[in-house]
Amino acid sequence: IAAHVISEASSKTTSVLQWAEKGYYTMSNNLVTLENGKQLTVKRQGLYYIYAQVTFCSNREASSQAPFIASLCLKSPGRFERILLRAANTHSSAKPCGQQSIHLGGVFELQPGASVFVNVTDPSQVSHGTGFTSFGLLKL
Amino acid sequence: IAAHVISEASSKTTSVLQWAEKGYYTMSNNLVTLENGKQLTVKRQGLYYIYAQVTFCSNREASSQAPFIASLCLKSPGRFERILLRAANTHSSAKPCGQQSIHLGGVFELQPGASVFVNVTDPSQVSHGTGFTSFGLLKL
Amino acid sequence: IAAHVISEASSKTTSVLQWAEKGYYTMSNNLVTLENGKQLTVKRQGLYYIYAQVTFCSNREASSQAPFIASLCLKSPGRFERILLRAANTHSSAKPCGQQSIHLGGVFELQPGASVFVNVTDPSQVSHGTGFTSFGLLKL
């Protein structure tokens, strides 16, 4: 069971990143699915290595004081969303903006029907060029 | 099937990074090989988690306007090269240069004879000290 | 065999990061253990994908000239410690400090009783907020 999906620009104002099965994507079988273009949902309980990579372009003067944060989050059936992993990068002083890349990854126990998704502080800063931003998992 | 190879400084002017089976490297068996010191080639079709880490040292004034970009690329037999993953980091203002590290990783389907390699915008900026820059894969 | 442990602030002056089985941690079975809150020790020989993520907050003026470096290290029974992976990030000019995240990961052969741990240049700069700093492995 494995998946690798590709970032998709979205007009939605949500902080949850959108993904698509496009380009050189992976969806090994129907035991993992991309739901609503926003979350990877697994049918089998077990240990999974889950990862995300986010490239963004921001400028210190044009952004809030707070850093750019990417969060890998979990939603289990009937339960609240919770943070699994986070990474933070202070905005660049480069103009008009400076690109930076974040990589998150870890091993987690998922229940049947559990979904994982990626949140960012400012989705408008995310880079959607080929290969820059992606999200995936593999069952151990 | 797994491999982990170590960066090697090169006098070549190519943007493709060079690697070696040295130090604490891994080459599990002959189903994955390091070819010409530049690409990992697999003999079996299947899903692979492929990763690369690149540490580099650059300075904004001494570099081009464009950021430092590391790309994980795929060459399948009889096919064109294509980008699997990319990461970008704006150059540092630190002098003489500021070190930064990039990590790339994802799950991809590889065909028999497929090769993966790592490209960077400026190989002269890559750090080859112990542990700083490496490249590997594992078959799921 | 898999583990994922969570960073723990420590009053110790050591450069070795401290970890705990807390929050959304993973410890699949007793073939991998967290020893003295500082190292993951494996009982079985084999290939392991080992990873660490470190988020830190630093300022160029308040820090040494040297970059912030995170090192993934190995201690095998009866052998010296050695570096497996390193990543380096130059300190930010943001005030009071600028956050940055480092991700390390690779495939390594471990002997029975081998331990892996994470070293940083300045543990006081490490961010211990939920999800920011973690460490783990999985047996292939």
């Epitope: 919770r82 998922l110 229940q111 | - | 089985e21 807390k22 907020g129």
Partner: nanobody, 117 residues
Framework: EVQLLESGGGLVQPGGSLRLSCAAS????????MSWVRQAPGKGLEWVSG????????YYADSVKGRFTISRDNSKNTLYLQMNSLRAEDTAVYYC??????????WGQGTLVTVSS
């Protein structure tokens, strides 16, 4: 032995406030995400709120967001739920629950909150 002891429930008028407490013992409190879960009369369990071990990240069900505040004091091994702007539909038995890697493994005996005029 793990013990979770809730207190602070009672009868309150709509729009009023209550503060629930949960005293924990028998485990290392600051290593676990803690939650409040409730069960209204004749209904199933509903998760209300959760707080990470450090207390730096909190989670809320949409039905209580902006009205309830979860907090913890790790030095006292105590979990709290401040409930403001209470409504009749908040009437339930409130349980404190300890979580381990995604599952609740221990519950308290509960404290009854009744919102009625």
């Amino acid at each position: 032995e793990v013990q979770l002891l809730e207190s602070g429930g009672g009868l309150v008028q709509p729009g009023g406030s209550l503060r629930l407490s949960c005293a924990a013992s028998g485990f290392t409190f600051d290593k676990y995400l803690m939650s409040w879960v409730r069960q209204a009369p004749g209904k199933g369990l509903e998760w209300v709120s959760g707080i990470e071990p450090l207390g730096d990240v909190t989670y809320y069900a949409d039905s209580v967001k902006g009205r309830f505040t979860i907090s913890r004091d790790n030095s006292k091994n105590t979990l709290y739920l401040q409930m403001n702007s209470l409504r009749a539909e908040d009437t339930a038995v409130y349980y404190c629950a300890k979580e381990a890697s995604g599952d609740f493994d221990y519950w308290g005996q509960g404290t009854l909150v009744t919102v009625s005029s």
